[in-house]
């Protein structure tokens, strides 16, 4: 007798642990920026502080009738999903509500900004334990709202936002598009994307993961013991805010980067039917449904990585795309992807003291994506080694020449526009371990890292016959840090990582042209962290 | 997202000298004006003036006051609704869109964003 959504996100082995934990023991505080709420509801009574913060626009229409239970509906339900006694994810977590949405569920960017500033002021006046901010709202893309989220996140606050219910690219909305927030899309009881009338959950590269958001039972403001079901990415975000609160209550020192990486790593993979999303968004949208991760004590020492896609470069000849990791993360590799296959490769460069992943469009190309592999590597010291393009017919080799540094990724960038004259680059694992090898006119970049116990190896998989993609996975216990496509067809679309799988994509037209001897190879660099071991390259 | 996606950024065409005030003429506007790409979600008449990151507390107030003073010279009344100190330097202002050009030329201004709606999801 447990609602489907709680069963989905809280594994059975966590249920009993939760049943033993006393209410109100957590020092974590969740701030909810939403409508007013009914604080006397049994689900949340005694654990909610209704602040005096109120910054909302007037309701539309002369005939609008302000009915308390309707005004409180959205916020009360979300408060219940986060910390409700019976239907909450983080039962007993204290919650502070700020009213930034009116009785019609409308607010303003400015009101939200003032709300975020109120939280920052509260934090300065009375520093407390970990803070989680739930933003179950969305407006059009706003540079200042995203900037405010960035500033607040840098003070150690964890922000969780709804992806939006517009069946659209979440990157077009704020705060969903802010890289520093954990952005959550919505799935139903069948783990499929939520449809809401003619619209539904947002998607795309700005979504970090999905969570239950359809027919979610939660506190109803209609009465002090009532429940109702509501749907939307707000409900999904509330689940993740609850999960984060539980993670922080067990381990209060977890950082935003660690929380996000652990949420991604321990989520349920590949259950969402990606066909629901527009074709061009499928590769960018994470196939992840949130579950409560185990504590780091149970899973210590794991190397955690995630894939970060850039925005599309646009079609101009010199258009570049840039993908960035979070400040705490290490950029272990950079690859690129273009639907037309017309790209001039990728490289890593330092901008403002931070390594970024760049990709360059080619003449006649429709644009590229840069794909960064961002990892949490404790006490890492990483550097980029590059070699300019060799003369015609010669290979370019780059290896990690510093002692105890291992190769975590390779990037290749071609100087020439003419796609027909160049061969694809190669990683040679057998003949030259730990080297990136480029062919004609390719500049080669090797990402080299030193960290206690870090060891890496290359794993390749080639297919000679017709195939739209070639994949290679790192085995259990190893984490994918680099992914490249090696020589084969004259035209490859590029390579990217999906969880622990390296995907090399080939152009449709290239399949027909290819001779059977010309294999397309997906090359993965797989690493693991063994704190007791020395950094090493595994043959 | 680093890029500004489906977002309107307008460089307003500004006369170099609007009323012969030396300090205004000296400051060339490099600031941009931004607004929501969805017209129905815009709130014209309310603007968030965002200042450069290192702007000091006193300078924020001075900038807001300067905007009020210069607007008054042109016969406009503007209302500063809120001053942002803690998350970013800036202020929220209710004013005519006619004054955007003037506001963009103020020292310390990085960009101005028109207020817009957000919605429960």
């Amino acid at each position: 007798s447990i609602p489907w959504n709680l069963e989905r996100i809280i594994p059975a082995w966590h249920q009993t642990e939760e049943d033993r934990s006393p209410d109100g023991s957590s020092q974590v505080e969740v701030y909810l920026l939403d409508t007013s709420i009914q604080g006397a509801h049994r689900e949340i009574e005694g654990r909610v502080t209704i602040t005096d913060f109120n910054s909302v626009p007037e309701e539309d229409g002369t005939r609008f009738h302000r009915q308390a239970s309707k005004c409180d509906s959205h916020g009360t339900h979300l408060a219940g999903v986060v910390s409700g006694r019976d239907a909450g994810v983080a039962k007993g977590t204290s919650l502070h509500s700020l009213r930034v949405l009116n009785c019609q569920g409308k607010g303003t960017v400015s009101g939200t900004l003032i709300g975020l500033e109120f939280i920052r002021k509260s934090q300065l006046i009375q520093p407390s334990g970990p803070l989680v901010v739930l933003l179950p709202l969305a407006g059009g893309y706003s540079r200042i709202l995203n900037a405010a989220c960035r500033h607040l996140a840098r003070t150690g606050v964890v922000l969780v936002a709804a992806a939006g219910n517009f069946r659209d690219d979440a990157c077009l909305y704020s705060p969903a598009s802010a890289p520093e927030v954990i952005t959550v899309g919505a799935t139903n009881a069948q783990d499929q994307p939520v449809t809401l009338g003619t619209l539904g959950t947002n998607f795309g590269r700005c979504v970090d993961l999905f969570a239950p958001g359809k027919d979610i039972i939660g506190a109803s403001s209609d009465c002090s013991t009532c429940f109702m079901s509501q749907s939307g990415t707000s409900q999904a975000a509330a689940h993740v805010a609850g999960i984060v609160a539980r993670m922080l209550s067990r381990e209060p020192t977890l950082t935003l980067a660690e929380l996000r990486q652990r949420l991604i790593h321990f989520s349920t993979k590949d259950v969402i039917n990606m066909a629901w999303f527009p074709e061009d968004q499928q590769v960018l949208t994470p196939n992840l449904v949130a579950t409560l991760p185990p504590s780091t004590h149970e899973t210590g020492g794991q190397l955690l990585c995630r894939t970060v896609w850039s925005a599309h470069s646009g079609p101009t000849r010199t258009a570049t795309a840039t993908a960035r990791c979070a400040p705490e993360e290490e950029l272990l590799s950079c690859s690129s992807f273009s639907r037309s296959g017309r790209r001039r490769g990728d490289w890593i460069e330092a901008i403002g003291g931070q390594q970024v992943c760049k990709a360059l469009n080619a003449f006649g190309g429709e644009g590229v994506y840069a794909v960064a592999r961002c990892c949490l590597v404790p006490r890492a010291n990483c550097s980029i080694h590059n070699t300019p393009a060799a003369r015609a017919g010669l290979e370019t080799h780059v290896h990690c020449h510093q002692k105890d540094h291992v190769l975590t990724g390779c990037s290749f960038h071609w100087e020439v526009e003419d796609l027909s004259v160049r061969r694809q680059p190669a990683l040679r694992s057998r003949r030259q371990p730990g080297q990136c090898v480029g062919h004609q006119a390719a500049s080669v970049y090797a990402s080299c890292c030193h960290a206690p116990g870090l060891e890496c190896k290359i794993k390749e998989h080639g297919i000679s016959g017709p195939s739209e993609q070639v994949t290679v996975a790192c085995e259990a216990g190893w984490t994918l840090t680099g992914c490249n496509v090696l020589p084969g067809a004259s035209l490859t679309l590029g390579a990217y990582s999906v969880d622990n799988l390296c995907v090399a994509r080939v152009h449709d037209t290239a399949r027909a042209d290819r001779t059977s001897g010309e294999a397309t190879v997906a090359a993965a660099i797989c690493c693991r962290s063994r704190p007791s071991a020395k950094a090493s390259w595994v043959q | 997202q680093d890029e500004d996606g489906d977002y309107e950024e307008l460089m307003l065409a500004l006369p170099s000298q609007e009323d012969g005030l030396a300090d205004e003429a000296a400051h060339v506007a490099t600031a941009t004006f931004r607004r929501c790409s969805k017209e129905a979600w815009r709130l014209p008449g309310t603007y968030i003036v965002v200042l450069m990151e290192e702007t000091q507390r006193l300078q924020i107030e001075q900038t807001a006051h300067r905007l009020q003073t210069r607007a008054a010279r042109r016969g406009y009344v503007i209302k500063v609704l809120h001053i942002f100190y803690d998350l970013f330097p800036g202020f929220l202002v209710k004013m005519s869109s006619d004054l955007l050009g003037l506001a963009l030329k103020l020292p310390h201004v990085e960009y101005i964003e028109e207020d817009s709606f957000v919605f429960a999801q």
Epitope: S1, P3, D23, D86, C223, S224, F227 | -
Partner: antibody
Framework: QLQLQESGPGLVKPSETLSLTCTVS??????????WTWIRQPPGKGLEWIGS???????YYNPSLKSRVTISVDTSKNQFSLKLSSVTAADTAVYYC??????????????????WGQGTLVTVSS | EIVLTQSPATLSLSPGERATLSCRAS??????LAWYQQKPGQAPRLLIY???NRATGIPARFSGSGSGTDFTLTISSLEPEDFAVYYC????????FGGGTKVEIK
Amino acid sequence: QLQLQESGPGLVKPSETLSLTCTVSGGSIWSSSYYWTWIRQPPGKGLEWIGSINYRGSTYYNPSLKSRVTISVDTSKNQFSLKLSSVTAADTAVYYCARENSGVVPAAGPNWFDPWGQGTLVTVSS
Amino acid sequence: EIVLTQSPATLSLSPGERATLSCRASQSVSSYLAWYQQKPGQAPRLLIYDASNRATGIPARFSGSGSGTDFTLTISSLEPEDFAVYYCQQRRNWFTFGGGTKVEIK
């Protein structure tokens, strides 16, 4: 069929603490579908809700009695208990325990008090 | 708190007659109102919930109506076992009970 049975001393001295236990049989307390409730009825008067508890020990009290009430649950014994401190003659009443569907699992039935124990009279007197 | 006022305090009727009991709330309780029956020396028993729904095993002669602030419990034809005290209860805001209406034999 679920049954509830109240037990505890029938006489308590003023300023002392009233303690009662309700034993649940024919069903388990361990369920997120229910709250376990105490209600009282002074002689010849109406009913007053005292407070409720769920299987996790999460409580919800009548604001007018909150400062004096403690409700606890012992899932291993399938019991829940009431403690009312600093009692006076005004606390003399028949004390009932009852089950309330929480509403979180709609299939569990209506969100009201049903069934009830038969009640136990507690007299506060020196 | 929401105060529930029941009227009349006592209703004297004969078996077979129709009984109409009223419960008025000090503020709207929507349809979150129940009716209980209590016989001497017994615990209350749930009759009607959410203003108009009969609880399991309750005869069809019992019906409830109303919403907002005014509610009615109707016993279409009184049986001997129906003579008891009836309480209304709301759950719109916490839980409160009415003072009760005693239905006695005339």
